[in-house]
């Protein structure tokens, strides 16, 4: 694994090929999670930020930007969207959490919580995922669509199997995240596929 502290994945072009596979040995279904990362893009169209598919299950967990100021979370192919007033283009720190028991999903944008939404109460997110940055999967690890590809930079990505309390979300935003047990930017197992470059993080 690699410590990517102070670095980002740069996706320099629109494509149907360029992506990063994130590798985790996640063995049991997710009842809760929190995902945090930083992103910087000047795309005004829709694009995938984080695509998690399992065998035979598309959009098992997907973080998707619909347009400026609109972020969507898919859980088990169901979707909620939260709105925020944001500058464009501008760097953003995104956290999203979901709790199976209540179905509550919550986005935090730059340390500020958006309106909570609910979906898939009682559902468990399947384990053994293929996780892709830079493209939106329509199959298990593939079937990409250029029009949903990400162009820009992504870094500081952490994923926990719990709903983090607000103070820990703020810690992640401020650059001092808790150790993460699904994906940890400081100890990341990944595979670069295509034209993706690792560069210093210069926009925080």
């Amino acid at each position: 694994h690699t410590d990517l502290s102070g670095k980002v994945f740069v996706f320099p072009r629109e494509s149907v090929t360029d992506h990063v596979n994130l590798i985790t040995p996640l063995e049991k279904p997710l009842q809760n999670f929190t995902l945090c990362f930083r992103a910087y893009s000047d795309l005004s169209r829709a694009y995938s930020l984080f695509s998690y598919n399992t065998q035979g299950r598309d959009n098992e967990l997907l973080v998707y930007k619909e347009r400026v100021g609109e972020y969507s979370l898919y859980i088990g192919r169901h979707k909620v969207t939260s709105k925020v007033i944001e500058k464009f283009p501008a760097p953003v720190h995104i956290c999203v959490s979901w709790e199976s028991s209540s179905g509550i999903a919550e986005f935090w944008i730059n340390g500020t919580p958006l309106v909570k939404k609910g979906l898939r109460q009682g559902y468990f997110v399947e384990a053994q995922p293929k996780i892709v940055l830079g493209q939106e999967q329509d199959s298990y690890g593939g079937k990409f669509d250029r029009s949903q590809s990400f162009v820009g930079e992504i870094g500081d990505l952490y994923m926990w199997d719990s709903v983090l309390p607000p103070e820990n979300i703020l810690s992640a935003y401020q650059g001092t995240p808790l150790p993460a047990n699904i994906l940890d930017w400081q100890a990341l197992n990944y595979e670069i596929r295509g034209y993706v470059i690792i560069k210093p993080l210069v926009w925080v």
Epitope: H1, T2, D3, L4, S5, G6, T24, P25, W160, D161, S162, L178, P179, N181, D184, Q186, A187, N189
Partner: antibody, heavy 119, light 107 residues
Framework: QVQLVQSGAEVKKPGSSVKVSCKAS????????MHWVRQAPGQGLEWIGM????????NYNEKFKSRATITADKSTSTAYMELSSLRSEDTAVYYC????????????WGQGTLVTVSS | DIQMTQSPSSLSASVGDRVTITCKAS??????VAWYQQKPGKAPKLLIY???YRYSGVPSRFSGSGSGTDFTLTISSLQPEDFATYYC?????????FGQGTKLEIK
């Protein structure tokens, strides 16, 4: 096989410093966080801090932040932990331990280095 | 810092016995707990990670359970080589912290 071999026992005077080494073999040294943990005689385990040898990023237990310095030499696959301003309470066995592949647990440990602080 | 409190601190048992050691965290640590075994003069060895997963090569008589604040290590049928000190550890928050240990002795 994966192995961590530490330097030998040390006897130090109060106020002095000690530098313990940990040589890694059998795996890619630059790909794993290395942690340091200590154990006072008859006591439990206490986490000191950690280093990623490739990025040289470190993280310390606040308790040791002002006195401990963790470094790594990629060319020799060796991690070091230096503790300064030693006092008698620092008498302990110091262990290096490798972080597991995917989780923040320690799957490989050095044999330990006894540091005795005595006047 | 998160305190990890183990109980009992020592325990006498016989070969073949079922033994349970508990660890209580001072705050929620989710499932981010490991158990280690340590024998005198030796380094600790990882037994259980993520509260309930046996580490590679660890005998099936060792099992772990729990989440949140309460965790358990169970040895289903004690073997002579199991007499040692056992430690729990949380890695949910920095600094990582350990329990004070449970010494398992032969009755």
């Amino acid at each position: 096989q994966v192995q961590l071999v530490q330097s030998g026992a040390e006897v130090k005077k109060p106020g002095s410093s000690v530098k313990v080494s940990c040589k890694a073999s059998g795996y890619t040294f630059t790909s794993y966080w290395m942690h340091w943990v200590r154990q006072a005689p008859g006591q439990g385990l206490e986490w000191i801090g950690m280093i990623h040898p490739n990025s040289v990023n470190t993280n310390y237990n606040e308790k040791f932040k002002s006195r401990a310095t963790i470094t790594a030499d990629k060319s020799t696959s060796t991690a070091y932990m230096e503790l300064s301003s030693l006092r008698s309470e620092d008498t302990a066995v110091y262990y290096c331990a490798r972080r597991n592949d995917y989780y923040w647990y320690f799957d490989v440990w050095g044999q330990g280095t006894l540091v005795t602080v005595s006047s | 810092d998160i305190q990890m409190t183990q109980s009992p601190s020592s325990l006498s048992a016989s070969v073949g016995d079922r033994v349970t050691i508990t660890c209580k965290a001072s705050q929620n640590v989710n499932s981010n707990v490991a158990w280690y075994q340590q024998k005198p003069g030796k380094a600790p060895k990882l037994l259980i990670y993520s509260a309930s997963y046996r580490y590679s090569g660890v005998p099936s008589r060792f099992s772990g359970s729990g989440s949140g604040t309460d965790f358990t290590l169970t040895i289903s049928s004690l073997q002579p080589e199991d007499f040692a000190t056992y430690y729990c550890q949380q890695c949910n928050n920095y600094p990582f912290t350990f329990g004070q240990g449970t010494k398992l002795e032969i009755k």
